[in-house]
């Protein structure tokens, strides 16, 4: 089986204040098995944004269907942008498990908030 | 074996209408995005367009956009570009490609199909 | 946009680096196209993918902002113009091109 990838395609998203930002996220394999998480920042003072799992997060919505069994996209969108919300966002693949443990990040995507235009 | 074939091209006068087409097979054309794009004479690749793999969701180059439409059918395997307002810098050859999972990369290319805008 | 050199020249037999930088992509993909109106060919999709009709003789790795196409071994059939792409859509997809001649 292929070995899995996580794609962030953006570097860097730039978004104005009050505005949705789409932050992008493919894998190219099914395997392994387990959710997708999407964090801010990194090591342990990182902040959950979004688990496939739980929820409700609500202001994060998923671009695709991700409750399709063959899906691989999993962008989210996070609405009403604040400049709390500047960040790197990591897209990371968990392995199934007592507990899920991580398995692979992708390369992480920086926002950053413009202010909001007069 | 992946095939791309895109219809003939041709030539056409500034502000008409052309349409082309790319017939797909040997791979799972529903479950793909497919992307048009093309190359002037002695210029490199210019992406302009590519559709979501049920066609909901279309994306486009600035230079084409409000000119061009792309569009697909999927039962019959088969990917389209809609050109109107047609402008000698639209002259080029145009190739139909298959998406990977990431729709920026392409896998499979057509041999691409020439379209000259002259009067 | 993204950045690669004009051309390069490899010996026959010999490796050839070709780069990629800048832009806003984390990922890079290159393609290959032997005479200009031919068809480009896949050679490399998402940093390190190589399509199954592919020589292993071509490999890519990505660091950072910079994406190299390696060929390892380099043939005469192997000159051509050598495009990357990016996977931001902001980057306009392609590089202008590395045109490699054979010496």
């Known amino acids: 089986e292929e070995e899995l990838q996580i794609i962030q395609p953006d570097k860097s998203v730039s978004v104005a204040a009050g505005e949705s930002a789409i932050l992008h996220c493919t894998i190219t394999s099914l395997f392994p098995v387990g959710p997708i998480q999407w964090f801010r920042g990194a090591g342990p003072a990182r902040v959950l944004i979004y688990n496939q799992r739980q929820g409700p997060f609500p202001r994060v919505t998923t671009v695709s269907e991700t409750t399709k069994r063959e899906n691989m996209d999993f962008s989210i969108s996070i609405s009403n942008i604040t400049p709390a919300d500047a960040g790197t966002y990591y897209c990371i693949k968990f392995r199934k498990g007592s507990p899920d443990t991580e398995f692979k990040s992708g390369a992480g995507t920086e926002l950053s908030v413009r202010a909001k235009p007069s | 074996d992946v095939q791309l074939v895109e219809s003939e091209g041709g030539v056409v006068r500034p502000g008409e209408s052309l349409r082309l087409s790319c017939e797909a097979s040997g791979f799972t054309f529903r479950n793909s995005y497919m992307t048009w794009v093309r190359q002037a004479p002695g210029e490199g690749l210019e992406w302009v367009s590519t559709?979501?793999?049920?066609?909901?969701?279309?994306y486009y180059a600035d230079s084409v956009k409000g000119r061009f439409t792309i569009s697909r059918d999927n039962s019959k395997n088969s990917l389209y570009l809609q050109m109107n307002s047609l402008r000698a810098e639209d002259t080029a050859i145009y190739y139909c490609?298959?998406?990977?999972?990431?729709?920026?990369?392409?896998?499979?290319w057509g041999l691409g199909t020439l379209v000259t805008v002259s009067s | 946009a993204l950045t690669q050199p004009a051309s390069v020249s490899a010996n026959l037999g010999g490796t050839v680096e070709i780069t990629c930088s800048g832009g806003?992509?984390?990922?890079y993909g290159w393609y290959q196209q032997k005479s200009p109106g031919s068809a480009p060919v896949t050679l490399i999709y998402a940093d390190t993918n190589r399509p199954s009709n592919i020589p292993s003789r071509f490999s890519g790795s990505t660091s950072g902002s910079t994406s190299t196409l390696t060929i390892t071994g380099v043939q005469a059939e192997d000159e051509a113009v050598y495009y990357c792409?990016?996977?931001?859509?902001?980057?306009?997809?392609f590089g202008a091109g590395t045109t490699l001649t054979v010496l």
């Open positions: 559709i979501s793999d049920t066609g909901d969701t279309a």
């Open positions: 792409g990016g996977s931001s859509t902001g980057d306009g997809i």
């Open positions: 490609a298959k998406s990977w999972i990431w729709w920026t990369f392409f896998d499979y």
């Open positions: 806003n992509s984390n990922h």
